[in-house]
């Protein structure tokens, strides 16, 4: 399953609207009945369903964490959507959390980028004014960090 | 390497209660269902149920309704089959088996456990 | 219950030899979907069922070609165009397209 999570089984309730199967498959924003003969829609808000398929229940919405803002709720065919708040963003290498966009640029660095949900800030070396390739850079620790412990490597 | 590997032979008596366990690797375990079979010595084979890991949504044959109970634990990525009120029409090699979620795919038993064998006596 | 039956019960056949099991089903086994839910599993002595077929005549990955089912509504056939030592066993047909799941007794292909 390509999607996030699978959505408790569902017994058709009288408010679940029900079709026949096109070819086998139902249409997005519903799921298959266990015997194969029947599409059951999903459940607004609490499940979905993005193509046609024969999958045996819809799946389950997608809760934005804290730290993320809804950008569009769940509706039976398309999954919630979030982002990450003002100040943090999403790696691609580690997308279940948003992480804290760096206050500054390592010495000799100059900012070319605001952070953005998606995107740390850029930093290019200043004589340069080019990207810097990805690397790892070991910040000397500020004041705020030595008091606090937190000073740390940071790849770019 | 898919892999089910289900829990060792089991002597109980008559009236009592078993578990036994179908422990899966090799593969995502919330991403299929898991059933279970029954085969009596020397006999054919009977499809007790199936249990969707992720949601413990389950679905039963009519015959094994108050007899078998289906449940499982995403963590461990094993599935469980409870027996009650035993007999010894019960005595029989019981099997997990694994199926897909789409329909299509749901009573293809891809991947076998090796066999719980169950012996009810007095 | 969709009853299974399976013709001959024991099999015998000399190994490079043809044979042919036969499944019956009591009702048609054709689903509203079009799709025809018959499947072959074999049990090698000792051990846990396989999967062979899947849908009348698909074979299931790393199953030998000279395996092949056909047939259709109530009648089905698994035919092994050479038989082999490593293919002795009881042969099982099931079908799913109705509830509940049922197999076949099972053939036993056993040497002459």
């Known amino acids: 399953i390509t999607q996030q999570d699978l959505a408790p089984q569902q017994r058709a309730a009288p408010q679940q609207k029900r079709s026949s199967p096109s070819e086998g498959l139902c249409p997005p924003g519903h799921h298959i009945s266990e015997d194969g003969r029947d599409c059951i829609s999903c459940k607004y808000g609490q499940d979905y369903s993005t193509h046609w398929n024969d999958l045996l229940f819809c799946l389950r919405c997608t809760r934005c964490d804290s730290g993320e803002v809804e950008l569009s709720p769940c509706t039976t065919t398309r999954n919630t959507v979030c982002q990450c708040e003002e100040g943090t963003f999403r790696e691609e290498d580690s997308p279940e959390m948003c992480r804290k966009c760096r206050t500054g640029c390592p010495r000799g660095m100059v900012k070319v980028g605001d952070c953005t949900p998606w995107s740390d800030i850029e930093c290019v070396h200043k004589e340069s004014r080019t990207v810097a390739a990805p690397s790892v850079f070991i910040f000397p620790p500020s004041d705020e960090q030595l008091k606090s412990g937190t000073a740390s490597v940071v790849c770019l | 390497e898919v892999q089910l590997q289900q829990s060792g032979p089991e002597l109980v008596k008559p009236g009592a209660s078993v578990k036994m366990s179908c422990k899966a690797s090799g593969y995502t375990f919330t991403s299929y269902v898991m059933h279970w079979v029954k085969q009596k010595p020397g006999q054919g084979l009977e499809w007790i149920g199936y249990i969707i890991p992720y949601n413990d949504g389950t679905k039963y044959n009519e015959k094994f309704k108050g007899k078998a109970t289906l449940t499982s634990d995403k963590s461990s990525s094993t599935a469980y089959m409870e027996l009650s009120r035993l007999t010894s029409e019960d005595s029989a090699v019981y099997y997990c088996?694994?199926?897909?979620?789409?329909?299509?795919?749901?009573?293809?038993?891809?991947?076998w456990g090796q066999g719980t064998t169950l012996t009810v006596s007095s | 219950d969709v009853v299974m039956t399976q013709i001959p019960l024991s099999l015998p056949v000399s190994l490079g030899d043809q044979a042919s099991i036969s499944c019956r089903s009591s009702q048609s086994l054709v689903h509203s979907n079009g799709n025809t839910y018959l499947h072959w599993y074999l049990q090698k002595p000792g051990q846990s069922p396989k999967l062979l077929i899947y849908k009348v005549s698909n074979r299931f990955s790393g199953v030998p070609d000279r395996f092949s089912g056909s047939g259709s509504g109530t009648d089905f056939t698994l035919k092994i165009s050479r038989v082999e030592a490593e293919d002795l066993g009881v042969y099982f047909c099931s079908q799913s397209t109705h509830v509940p799941h049922t197999f076949g007794g099972g053939t036993k292909l056993e040497i002459k």
């Open positions: 088996a694994r199926g897909g979620i789409n329909y299509d795919y749901l009573y293809y038993f891809d991947y």
